[in-house]
């Protein structure tokens, strides 16, 4: 069977006027997962995103991440998109005063 991922979007200051947004997927099985950033619903090119490897997390499941740098104040234009085992979900960037957005996809 499959185990759906926990998806968590975080933000961190990158440089003046920019922030790095990171989308992490964890505790999923099997290992094949799509995780990518969109701006205004349009997929970002590969060369503007950074990916972590899909790694075992020690529980028989896997974890990975994708990050991109964006302009501060434009967070609402960006979403992290996930596909896994025939399911999909979309995850927004949290506002500045909230640093975590969790979603366990079922």
């Amino acid at each position: 069977g499959s185990v759906p991922p926990m998806v968590n979007v975080t933000r961190s200051e990158a440089s003046e006027g920019n922030i790095t947004v990171t989308c992490r997927a964890s505790s999923f099985y099997p290992r094949n997962i799509t995780l990518t950033w969109r701006q205004d619903g349009v997929s970002l090119s590969h060369d503007t995103q950074q990916w972590g490897d899909v790694l075992p997390d020690g529980n028989g499941t896997y974890q990975t991440w994708v990050a991109t740098r964006i302009c501060q104040g434009e967070e609402q234009r960006f979403t992290c998109y996930m596909e896994h085992s025939g399911n999909h979900s979309t995850h927004p960037v949290p506002s500045g005063n909230s640093h975590h957005h969790h979603h366990h996809h079922h």
């Epitope: 997929s43 596909e83 999909h88």
Partner: antibody
Framework: QVQLKESGPGLVAPSQSLSITCTVS????????VNWVRQPPGKGLEWLGM???????DYNSALKSRLSISKDNSKSQIFLKMNSLQTDDTARYYC??????????????WGAGTTVTVSS | DIQMTQTTSSLSASLGDRVTISCSAS??????LNWYQQKPDGTVKLLIY???SLPSGVPSRFSGSGSGTDYSLTISNLEPEDIATYYC?????????FGGGTKVEIK
Amino acid sequence: QVQLKESGPGLVAPSQSLSITCTVSGFALTGSGVNWVRQPPGKGLEWLGMIWGDGNTDYNSALKSRLSISKDNSKSQIFLKMNSLQTDDTARYYCARGAHYGKRWYFDVWGAGTTVTVSS
Amino acid sequence: DIQMTQTTSSLSASLGDRVTISCSASQGINNYLNWYQQKPDGTVKLLIYYTSSLPSGVPSRFSGSGSGTDYSLTISNLEPEDIATYYCQQYSKLPPTFGGGTKVEIK
């Protein structure tokens, strides 16, 4: 077994619109992207666009104004519609499943293609 | 758009030969490169992904290498079923773009 099969009109008159259907089996459209690629006679391959599992679409900007990609998950079908066809749209049109895993993005299974001729 | 160039549009080789097909990008593509094989009947098959990874079912005589702007596909021991046209494809930037193809024929 993953399979994709295109079906189209064969012949389209200039200025008319083109509709092609891609029927898939062996995987769920809710969790896989499907791409459209075409190949004019004697030429190379050109990516037209794709539709993701959630129905979101990405298009080749050179053709975006004339293209529309949609799908029916329950029928396992993806639809390509292109408007205002000209003779240089004559090509073999392929649908292909996209595999997008981190740094890897490739078209792992292709349909056999359907030939479309634009002529009066 | 990123332009992909395959300078050799066709080549002839003998069975058992080592064949190398080159592909260059108009800018660096960070190994975001795939290779496809198109048979004379139009059938298209994924051959190599992410510069050098081999999908299951693809014979080990096929290999890929490269970095930056320059990439290559090698067939180490040409067999009759390898008669086809080979296309490189980048996905570093949208839209994904293909090279013009290299047709491999038997001498």
